[in-house]
Interface confidence: medium
């Protein structure tokens, strides 16, 4: 199978981690979302609905 990170899918400098069932983006500080596409606003709010339970902004998400 092709490396899922080869296309550099993580935005804003997020680290891409390949694993057996796909990929995970670990977001740079200040970004969140499955592909690190959403900025975390300075007041702690984000540009998308609240993160799923157990995930903090910037945590790796599938």
């Amino acid at each position: 199978r092709a490396d899922p990170c080869a296309a550099r899918p993580c935005a804003h400098g997020g680290r891409c981690y390949a694993h057996f069932s796909g990929l995970v983006c670990a977001c740079a500080p200040g970004y969140m979302g499955a592909r690190c596409e959403f900025p975390v606003h300075p007041d702690g709010a984000s540009a998308l609905p609240a993160a799923p339970p157990g995930l903090r902004p910037g945590d790796p998400q599938r």
Epitope: D3, C5, R15, C16, Y17, H19, F20, A26, P60, R62
Partner: antibody
């Protein structure tokens, strides 16, 4: 020149803690992490954990998780390893190594620069 | 956890002959495989990363290949300075535990026949 220098080795009592330091110079941490690897006498290499300072993330090997802490002191470009509840089986040469995480946008995950190693002996 | 298995455990090669070392991962690691050389009393040295890319300053008699779970290091013409222990190393990520990890093979000792 890119360099890693470990310090803090020596004799540690069983049940105690070992604390080692790794001084890094000659590179920035935006695309690099620092890993700790150990080698018991006459044995192979054993990965313990690494820190990704730019992202503030630390990853530990499952066999040592709960006993290990890797901390950065980025103001001094130093990284410490603490291993608790040591036994004679923790006697080893401990290396820190630079982990090239991303090079030219491509994930790399090789340990391209190593320190000279520091020997820790656990014995009463 | 992933397990890396090298074969053979040791290898005796005549000068100028080819040496081949195999490394098998217990799960798919794509191309995240590095090779190291270690000489007695010294720290390991990176030879190859991302399966086949030579690290800086490594002679081109070294080459790496493979993907997924099976990888190979070849030394095309062994020289006396190539004696040492060779390790493969994988990188993998377990999404279930948000766990980025490295694993080494047990090592292959190369000596001159």
């Amino acid at each position: 020149e890119v360099q890693l220098v470990e310090s803090g080795g020596g004799l540690v009592q069983p049940g105690g803690s070992l604390r080692l330091s790794c001084a890094a110079s000659g590179f920035t941490f935006s695309n690099y992490g620092v890993s700790w690897v150990r080698q018991a006498p006459g044995q192979g290499l054993e990965w313990m954990g690494y820190i990704d300072p730019a992202f503030g993330r630390t990853y530990y090997a499952s066999w040592v998780n709960g006993r290990i802490t890797i901390n950065p002191d980025t103001s001094k470009n130093q990284f410490s390893l603490q291993l608790n509840s040591v036994t004679p089986e923790d006697t080893a040469v401990y290396y820190c190594a630079r982990v090239a995480l991303v090079v030219a946008g491509v994930a790399y995950y090789g340990m391209d620069v190593w320190g000279q190693g520091t020997l820790v002996t656990v014995s009463s | 956890d992933i397990v890396m298995t090298q074969s053979p455990d040791s290898l005796a090669v005549s000068l100028g002959e080819r040496a081949t070392i195999n490394c098998q991962a217990s799960q798919n690691i794509y191309s995240y495989l590095s090779w190291y050389q270690q000489k007695p009393g010294k720290a390991p040295k990176l030879l190859i990363y991302r399966t086949s890319t030579l690290a800086s300053g490594v002679p081109d008699r070294f080459s790496g290949s493979g993907s997924g779970t099976d990888f190979t290091l070849k030394i095309s013409r062994v020289e006396a300075e190539d004696v040492g222990v060779y390790y493969c190393q994988s990188y993998y990520y377990s999404s279930g535990s948000s766990y980025g990890a490295f694993a080494f093979g047990q090592g292959t000792k190369v000596e001159i026949k």
